[in-house]
């Protein structure tokens, strides 16, 4: 069975062309979005930025794995990026999009 | 593969006795912790409280499912609970523990 590494941030560059957004996004051409992945298994150490609830859920999962899942590995810190794009009326707009870049991950 | 329902909050009562914490936690005897579970699949609708990053990650996952996972279903709102317990010196302490109760879930 696949043994996964502990919850952590993984690097991921997203190309807007790959997403099919090149016709409305002028700049940037893409960005370092990153993503979170990995196991949230007992014991949840300090690197895993676990909430109190995640710690409790992990213990309940160990007791009752058929009904309660492990916590999941999700972003704990997200950053914005600025995007230059065409709106529906072909105006060029500069807008800051929140929660676009994963800066850190944790067990939730 | 596993066919799961969409990301949502599930009810879960946690008994401190089941966790083996009954000797140091005086009250409450347990609490409604709840948990998040379910799929974060395309399209991410409004109920899924998805971040911008989760929307992007979902699209990248569709293009490259082997390399990039789906976003995960995690708490978006957590509440505290007050706990009466014995400390290491057998003093009775009342403390508010943050992030103990899941109030809402979303795709992250």
């Amino acid at each position: 069975s696949e043994l996964k590494t502990a919850c952590k941030k993984h690097e991921l560059y997203v190309s807007f062309q790959d997403l099919g957004w090149q016709d409305w996004i002028i700049a940037p051409k893409g960005y370092a979005a990153n993503y979170c992945d990995g196991e949230c298994s007992f014991p949840l150490n300090a690197h895993m930025n676990a909430t109190n609830h995640a710690i409790v859920q992990t213990l309940v999962h160990l007791m009752n794995p058929e009904y309660v899942p492990k916590p999941c590995c999700a972003p704990t810190k997200l950053n914005a990026i600025s995007v230059l794009y065409f709106d529906d009326n072909s105006n060029v707009i500069l807008k800051k999009y929140r929660n676009m870049v994963v800066r850190a991950c944790g067990c939730h | 593969s596993e066919l799961k329902t969409a990301c949502k909050k599930h009810e879960l009562y946690v008994s401190f006795q089941d966790l083996g914490w009954q000797d140091w936690i005086i009250a409450p005897k347990g609490y409604a912790a709840n948990y998040c579970d379910g799929e974060c699949s395309f399209p991410l609708n409004a109920h899924m409280n998805a971040t911008n990053h989760a929307i992007v990650q979902t699209l990248v996952h569709l293009m490259n499912p082997e390399y990039v996972p789906k976003p995960c279903c995690a708490p978006t709102k957590l509440n505290a609970i007050s706990v009466l317990y014995f400390d290491d010196n057998s003093n009775v302490i009342l403390k508010k523990y943050r992030n103990m109760v899941v109030r809402a879930c979303g795709c992250h």
Epitope: L3, K4, N64, P65, Y67 | G38
Partner: antibody, heavy 121, light 112 residues
Framework: QVQLVESGGGLVKPGGSLRLSCAAS????????VHWVRQAPGKGLEWVGR??????????SYAAPVKGRFTISRDDSKNTLYLQMNSLKTEDTAVYYC????????????WGQGTLVTVSS | QSVLTQPPSVSGAPGQRVTISCTGS?????????VHWYQQLPGTAPKLLIY???ERPSGVPDRFSGSKSGTSASLAITGLQAEDEADYYC???????????FGGGTKLTVLG
């Protein structure tokens, strides 16, 4: 009282198919995770797979030896669990049990009597 | 070969105490997962004997007890009786995909 009754076992040739059923009664079937476990003649217990309940989206998981050949499903309206077995091999010969998982500590608290599947030419 | 390791057989005289070990690894018992024990009398389906390491379902005599430490668990039977002659299986989960794992089983023989 809680009861699980398997049926559908029998003799089948290698490469053949068979569908087992497990009829549940005496409890709210739709709220429980249920599994299939098998036991080859004179051997130990071997986990086959599970289906979770509706609130968990009927998610299924399988043991490596049966993955891709066996399919677990359930019909909550009929209180019945199924095991569809395709591409059967001689090593699938066993008594097949369905088992209910209790809700607090995940133990298999109720088992059916088992149904014998013999794969032989 | 089973994921959890049990001795193939143990024996004891009536009234004696016997223990059955169940050894796992850091991905199952050692990962913190619960251990359950099942008794299978000859020609019958398995029956839950101990759940959550040490809890007994109603109707199971207190002669049966379970414990867990590190990557191992054990089942103890005191005051051995002829009707205890059966196969005993331990069960836990594998942490990577939360799949069920069993021990290979232990045949208990009550002597005399």
């Amino acid at each position: 009282q809680v009861q699980l009754v398997e049926s559908g076992g029998g003799l089948v040739k290698p490469g053949g198919s068979l569908r087992l059923s497990c009829a549940a009664s005496g409890f709210t079937f739709s709220s429980y995770v249920v599994h299939w476990v098998r036991q080859a003649p004179g051997k130990g217990l071997e986990w086959v797979g599970r289906t979770r309940h509706s609130d968990m989206g009927y998610a299924t998981s399988y043991a490596a030896p049966v993955k891709g050949r066996f399919t677990i499903s359930r019909d909550d309206s009929k209180n019945t669990l199924y095991l569809q077995m395709n591409s059967l091999k001689t090593e699938d010969t066993a008594v097949y049990y369905c088992a209910r998982v209790e809700r607090s500590k995940s133990g298999f608290d109720n088992w059916g009597q088992g149904t014998l599947v013999t794969v032989s030419s | 070969q089973s994921v959890l390791t049990q001795p193939p057989s143990v024996s004891g005289a009536p009234g004696q105490r016997v223990t059955i070990s169940c050894t796992g690894s850091s991905s199952n018992i050692g990962a913190g997962y619960s251990v359950h024990w099942y008794q299978q009398l000859p020609g019958t389906a398995p029956k839950l004997l101990i759940y959550g390491q040490s809890e007994r379902p109603s109707g199971v005599p207190d002669r049966f007890s379970g414990s867990k430490s590190g990557t191992s668990a054990s089942l103890a039977i005191t005051g051995l009786q002829a009707e205890d002659e059966a196969d005993y299986y331990c069960q836990s989960w594998d942490s990577s995909q939360t799949l069920v794992v069993f021990g290979g089983g232990t045949k208990l023989t009550v002597l005399g």
